[in-house]
Interface confidence: low
């Protein structure tokens, strides 16, 4: 017996109660592929979520987070509160980074400043709660008679943790 369901396009479902007729997905549901025996319920963007893309009969709704929150995870499956630069989110809310750590974003955790001496370099610019230290030439490069042709090492890109 041929499976007539394979003929049902996206946006419909194969209705076994009606001799495998392709029925349109009911309101607030969708099927993104053909041959489906049911339609999936549309995602609802409510509460801390806001709608980025409305649900259609062939594709699910897509959500964003309201102002003051940012998306977390694939397809914005969660929203998390923003903090300021120089802070991290804890169970008790946003807290300032401890001395020796920084966070240059509104999300994520405070990370340790780069240890310039591990690369044989010196601190050119001190770190803050919001910014990593900037490493400069090694102390030996700065001694009298040393060549000054070597430019200072660039600061690490934001958001990259120390190696």
């Amino acid at each position: 017996l041929q499976d007539l369901c394979s003929n049902c396009p996206a946006g419909t479902f194969c209705d076994n109660n009606r001799s495998q007729i392709c029925s349109p997905c009911p309101p607030n549901s969708f099927s993104s592929a053909g041959g489906q025996r049911t339609c999936d319920i549309c995602r609802q963007c409510k509460g801390v979520f806001k709608t980025r893309k409305e649900c259609s009969s062939t594709s699910n709704a897509e959500c964003d987070c309201i102002s003051g929150y940012h998306c977390l995870g694939a397809e914005c499956s969660m929203c998390e509160q923003d903090c300021k630069q120089g802070q991290e989110l804890t169970k008790k809310g946003c807290k300032d980074c401890c001395f020796g750590t920084f966070n240059d974003q509104k999300r994520g955790i405070c990370r340790p400043w780069t240890n310039c001496s591990l690369d044989g370099k010196s601190v050119l610019v001190n770190g803050t709660k919001e910014r990593d230290v900037v490493c400069g030439p090694s102390p030996a490069d700065l001694s009298p008679g040393a060549s000054s042709a070597t430019p200072p090492a660039p600061a690490r890109e934001p958001g990259h943790s120390p190696q």
Epitope: G47, Y69, G73, A74, M78, C79, E80, K91, I109
Partner: antibody
């Protein structure tokens, strides 16, 4: 204090359906996601899915989507997981868990756990 | 799905020793990692969240670290009550996934 109460054990015949319960107390039931987690003997943990009791919004692990159905009864502050067509592979301990914080921000970590229901699938 | 690979699967140590358990994610999970402890026949208990923050009541001999895809749980000066199984879990994306677990036994 927060409590998630689960029956200790369930014996189910292969192919029959089993509905596991998780009775919550000590907090506002509708404000916190409830998760279900599977642990086979001597093995790791597997997340099945979760449900937000306020509006019954669910997320599922695709692996379980066809056979697990999560529901809640707000009047009794109870969450349920129905497992259809179980086989011996479904013999495991099933935990219900609750996320730590209410609403947002939410760490999506499982701070509270029920004692687990041991499901044995056997004829 | 993000796969979590935990190692070692088992280890034995003595009271007072320091041990480290590692967890590798198949993609960047940006510190959205939790560690759980599970005693024989009991439910797991949250130890660490956000990769490094200790849950309430967890002794300071436990510490979490890591970033990107590589994370670790360190237990300093092991106590008798620390023996059992440990699980890591990512909550960066659905489906939430766990490592295979590490069984810590008394030597």
């Amino acid at each position: 204090q927060v409590q998630l109460q689960q029956p200790g054990a369930e014996l189910v015949r292969p192919g029959a359906s089993v509905k596991l319960s998780c009775k919550a107390s000590g907090y506002t039931f509708t404000s916190y996601w409830i998760n279900w987690v599977k642990q086979r003997p001597g093995q790791g943990l597997e997340w099945i899915g979760n449900i937000f009791p306020s509006d019954s919004y669910t997320n599922y692990n695709q692996k379980f989507k066809d056979r697990a159905k999560l529901t809640v009864d707000k009047s009794s502050s109870t969450a349920y997981m129905q497992l259809s067509s179980p086989t011996s592979e479904d013999s495991a301990v099933y935990y219900c868990t609750r996320f730590g914080s209410s609403g947002y921000p939410d760490y999506y970590t499982m701070e509270y756990w029920g004692q687990g229901t041991s499901v044995t699938v056997s004829s | 799905d993000i796969q979590m690979t935990q190692s070692p699967a088992s280890l034995s140590a003595s009271v007072g020793e320091t041990v480290t358990i590692t967890c590798r994610a198949s993609g960047n999970i940006d510190n959205y990692l939790a560690w759980y402890q599970q005693k024989q026949g009991k439910s797991p208990q949250l130890l660490v969240y956000n990769a490094k923050t200790l849950a309430e009541g967890v002794p300071s001999r436990f510490s979490g670290s890591g970033s990107g895809t590589e994370y670790s749980l360190k237990i300093n000066s092991l106590q008798p009550e620390d023996f059992g199984s440990y699980h890591c879990q990512q909550y960066w994306t659905i489906p939430y996934t766990f490592g295979g677990g590490t069984k810590l036994e008394i030597k």
